[in-house]
Every structure is written in structure tokens, then in C-alpha cells.
């Protein structure tokens, strides 16, 4: 399931004059396109120009993160008057071209969703024949990946005087609550910390001081689901003090 | 820059420079929505762009001022943002924070 | 960057006078914007894509152009047009805006 966001402006001016948008250049792209991970998802772009009857050399590129400078996940090549867009690169293979760029459509298919995916892409189509031109979506479509939350770690470690804290890091979009049980702890949030930069969908719980010995349960949730990973903690006291 | 009377996440925030008695320059733009940014080359370490989408407010920090920075600093609001064929250029401006470098 | 030159930078003209200001851009753009600014307040939308006026912009005020070339015509000039002037493109980044044309009244 795709959910793609429409545009639904208030009207600020007056009617415009139409004149027919197909002589300019400009790039019709949605605000944003939601999809859950594992799924595929469809990028819309649609262009148009002002050379009338275009039928030389064409490139059409997509590009993640920032306009004109972001790296390319997706580059094909059509020969001039060819309907067929060579794929010349498609990262990790996952990315397919829908649309026919003769045609004003540069869609884009994104296969196998992951989290990383999660930014936003820039459509960009390049002419090469007797006209050179080029023009490039400026704000793109942000793609937005939601995904059931995914316990990445749980731990215990060390702490100060012998004592022990436990760890657990999720995945997920939404980012995910997370909250600890286990012995004399009832139900516990913990210190949950923030999604860290750079990984915006990471969130982290810590328990800080584990008094009983025990099962210890991290449970991560959002609105697409849960997720719950316990770590045990048995204290032998031997002459170097606790450990587990 | 705190907005009000419309959808806030739904447009970008640019914000654009203006030395007394010169013309206008555009320093960057952000989504609200996401928080995702545009930055003209040319202010990129001198601004920095967020929003608190609470408040809906826009917020602009100049680092390392100079004279140069001493200027009116705008904030504009876009007419649309699904494509540029229904951009309307800035149609909504602030009235202007003056900022004076001394030393 | 795309640079955008406007011309004149200073002029005037006596009520009732047509009067046309270019705004040339060093390459092509889809559609270009237009500013009025007077002493003292923000920048007001002026024309939006090239040929539409904004709310509240009188009829008297047209826009025109293509490519790399575009312009800003008052009909027959009145005394509440004294004001600066500024064309801004879109097409590709940075977003620039011309250097303004000052517009009084003779």
C-alpha cells in the first residue's frame, strides 16, 4: 500500500492566465509518498518542456538526499528516438524506471524498502541532441518508509561499584516506545534516550541500576506493531565480586 | 518567525538577507515537515535553518557575525511546493528583523 | 549561479507614462517573479509565473518574457508605482533575485 500526499494548496492569488505549461520547463512532483518497509513504492515525477517533438538522446536520473549535488541511485539512457531508457545504474538493483521518459514521465519504483531509504529524491531529466538542455525537480519527493519496530540489541553492562545496567536499542517508524520489565521493576519506561543524529529511527532505553537477579524484558512498540527481547541476569559471587 | 492562519507543516519557510540600502539574497529554505533543508552555498555555516512545529515557528541562528551580517533579515513563505509549475513565488513576507553587527 | 541583470537600475517616469523594466537572466529559467518593495516594508508578490498578477495588483501592471529574457510593464504610470523592483528566478539553485530597479516619479 502506497499513500501518496496531494498538494492541496489554498488559493493565495488571483486566477492565474493559464498559458499552456507544456512550453516551460517544470517538474510535477508530490510532496511525499509513504510506504512500509519490505514494500515497494512508486515515485511520481512527470515533466514538461518547451522542445516541442523532442525526440534526441535523453537522460533521466534520480537522486537522493539533495538536489543537483546528491548521489545518483538511478541513471538510464535513451538513444535518439528510442522509447526504450537503458538503465545505466540502479543501486543495489532495487531501483526501476516506470515511466516513459518520451512520454514526460520519469516514475520511478522502488523495490525491497528499507529504512535507509527513508529521504528524499530528486527527479532530473537531461536532453543531449541538437537542444542541451536539463532540468531538475527542486524540492523532490520525500519518501516516507514505516516499519514495525525491530529490537537491534540488548545488553547488560557493567557499571560503577559492582552494579549492572541493561540496554536495548530499537528500530522503527514511528520511532518506537520502549519500555523494560522484569524483576521488582513492575512496568518501566527507563531513561529512553532520543533518536541519535544520524540515526533517526534508532531509539535507545536504558535501565539503569538492575537490582534482582532475573529475566529482564525490553518491549518495543509503534502503530505498526511490537517487538520484545529479554536478557537474564545471574550473579555468582565468586572472590572478584558479581558478575554475570 | 512564527506563522499562523495556515496548514505550517503544508509550506516551506525561506528566509532572504537585505543590506541597508541593497537588494535581496536568499540564505535557504526548509520543509516544516520534516525539517529537511536548502541552503544557498553561500550561507552554508553562516545560517542555520529549524522549526519548532509546536509553536510553528521558523527560526534562522547566524554564527560568527561580522559587519557583513549586519543587514534585515526576512522570512517568506512559498505559494506552494508539489511542483514549480504551481510555485508562486513568496507570497506571504515578515516584516523584517533588523540585526546590527557592532563591534 | 544564475545571475540576474535588471535595467535600468534607477529611472522615472511622469504619470501616465509606460513604463517597462527587463530583467535578464545569464541563463534560461521556466518562469520568473516579481517583487515591489518601498522604503521602510517587506517585499510584496508583485507577479507570480511570469504573467499573473498578484491579489491586489493593479491591472495597469503586466509581466511577459521566455527563455532568458523577461520584463515588468506599468500601462500608464501613477504615483503609488514609485518603488523598487526586483525579478527573481526559481529554476535552479540558488534561488537569485535581480539587483532591483528604483522606480520614481518625474
Known amino acids: 500500500f502506497v499513500r501518496t500526499k496531494i498538494d492541496t494548496t489554498e488559493n493565495l492569488l488571483n486566477t492565474e492566465v493559464h498559458s499552456s505549461p507544456a512550453q516551460r520547463w517544470s517538474m510535477q512532483v508530490p510532496p511525499e509518498v509513504s510506504a512500509e518497509a519490505g514494500d515497494a513504492a512508486v515515485l511520481p515525477c512527470t515533466f514538461t518542456h518547451p522542445h516541442r517533438h523532442y525526440d534526441g538522446p535523453l537522460t533521466a536520473i534520480w537522486r537522493a538526499g539533495e538536489p543537483y549535488a546528491g548521489p545518483q541511485v538511478f541513471r538510464c539512457a535513451a538513444a535518439r528516438g528510442s522509447e526504450l531508457c537503458q538503465t545505466a545504474l540502479s543501486l543495489h538493483g532495487r531501483f526501476r524506471l516506470l515511466g516513459n521518459p518520451r512520454r514526460n514521465d520519469l516514475s520511478l519504483r522502488v523495490e525491497r524498502l528499507a529504512l535507509a531509504d527513508d529521504r528524499r529524491y530528486f527527479c532530473r531529466v537531461e536532453f543531449a541532441g541538437d537542444v542541451h538542455d536539463r532540468y531538475e525537480s527542486r524540492h523532490g519527493v520525500r519518501l516516507h518508509v514505516t516499519a514495525a519496530p525491530r529490537i537491534v540489541n540488548i545488553s547488560v553492562l557493567p557499571s560503577p561499584a559492582h552494579a549492572f545496567r541493561a540496554l536495548c536499542t530499537a528500530e522503527g517508524e514511528p520511532p518506537p516506545a520502549l519500555a523494560w520489565s522484569g524483576p521488582a521493576l513492575g512496568n518501566s519506561l527507563a531513561a529512553v534516550r532520543s533518536p541519535r543524529e544520524g540515526h533517526g529511527h534508532l531509539v535507545t532505553a536504558e535501565l539503569p541500576a538492575l537490582t534482582h537477579d532475573g529475566r529482564y524484558t525490553c518491549t518495543a512498540a509503534n502503530s505498526l506493531g511490537r517487538s520484545e527481547a529479554s536478557v537474564y541476569l545471574f550473579r555468582f559471587h565468586g572472590a572478584s565480586g558479581a558478575s554475570t | 518567525c512564527k506563522a499562523s492562519?495556515?496548514?505550517?507543516?503544508?509550506?516551506?519557510m525561506d528566509w532572504v538577507k537585505q543590506r541597508p540600502g541593497q537588494g535581496l539574497e536568499w540564505i535557504g529554505e526548509?520543509?516544516?515537515?520534516?525539517?529537511?533543508?536548502n541552503y544557498n552555498q553561500k550561507f552554508k555555516g553562516k545560517a542555520t535553518l529549524t522549526v519548532d512545529k509546536f509553536s510553528r515557528t521558523a527560526y534562522m541562528e547566524l554564527s560568527s557575525l561580522t559587519s557583513e551580517d549586519s543587514a534585515v533579515y526576512y522570512c517568506?513563505?512559498?505559494?506552494?511546493?508539489?511542483?514549480?509549475?504551481?510555485?508562486?513565488?513568496?507570497?506571504?513576507w515578515g516584516q523584517g528583523t533588523l540585526v546590527t553587527v557592532s563591534a | 549561479e544564475n545571475v540576474l541583470t535588471q535595467s535600468p537600475a534607477i529611472m522615472s517616469a511622469s504619470p501616465g507614462e509606460k513604463v517597462t523594466i527587463s530583467c535578464s537572466a545569464s541563463?534560461?529559467?521556466?518562469?520568473m517573479y516579481w517583487y515591489q518593495q518601498k522604503p521602510g516594508s517587506s517585499p510584496k508578490p508583485w507577479i507570480y509565473?511570469?504573467?499573473n498578477l498578484a491579489s491586489g495588483v493593479p491591472a495597469r501592471f503586466s509581466g511577459s518574457g521566455s527563455g532568458t529574457s523577461y520584463s515588468l510593464t506599468i500601462s500608464s504610470m501613477e504615483a503609488e508605482d514609485a518603488a523598487t523592483y526586483y525579478c527573481?528566478?526559481?529554476?535552479?539553485?540558488?534561488?537569485?533575485f535581480g539587483a532591483g530597479t528604483k522606480l520614481e516619479l518625474k
Open positions: 509565473r511570469t504573467s
Open positions: 541563463s534560461s529559467v521556466s518562469y
Open positions: 527573481q528566478q526559481w529554476s535552479s539553485n540558488p534561488l537569485t
Open positions: 517568506a513563505r512559498s505559494g506552494a511546493y508539489s511542483s514549480d509549475y504551481s510555485y508562486d513565488g513568496f507570497a506571504y
Open positions: 492562519g495556515y496548514t505550517f507543516t503544508r509550506y516551506w
Open positions: 526548509i520543509d516544516p515537515s520534516d525539517s529537511y533543508t
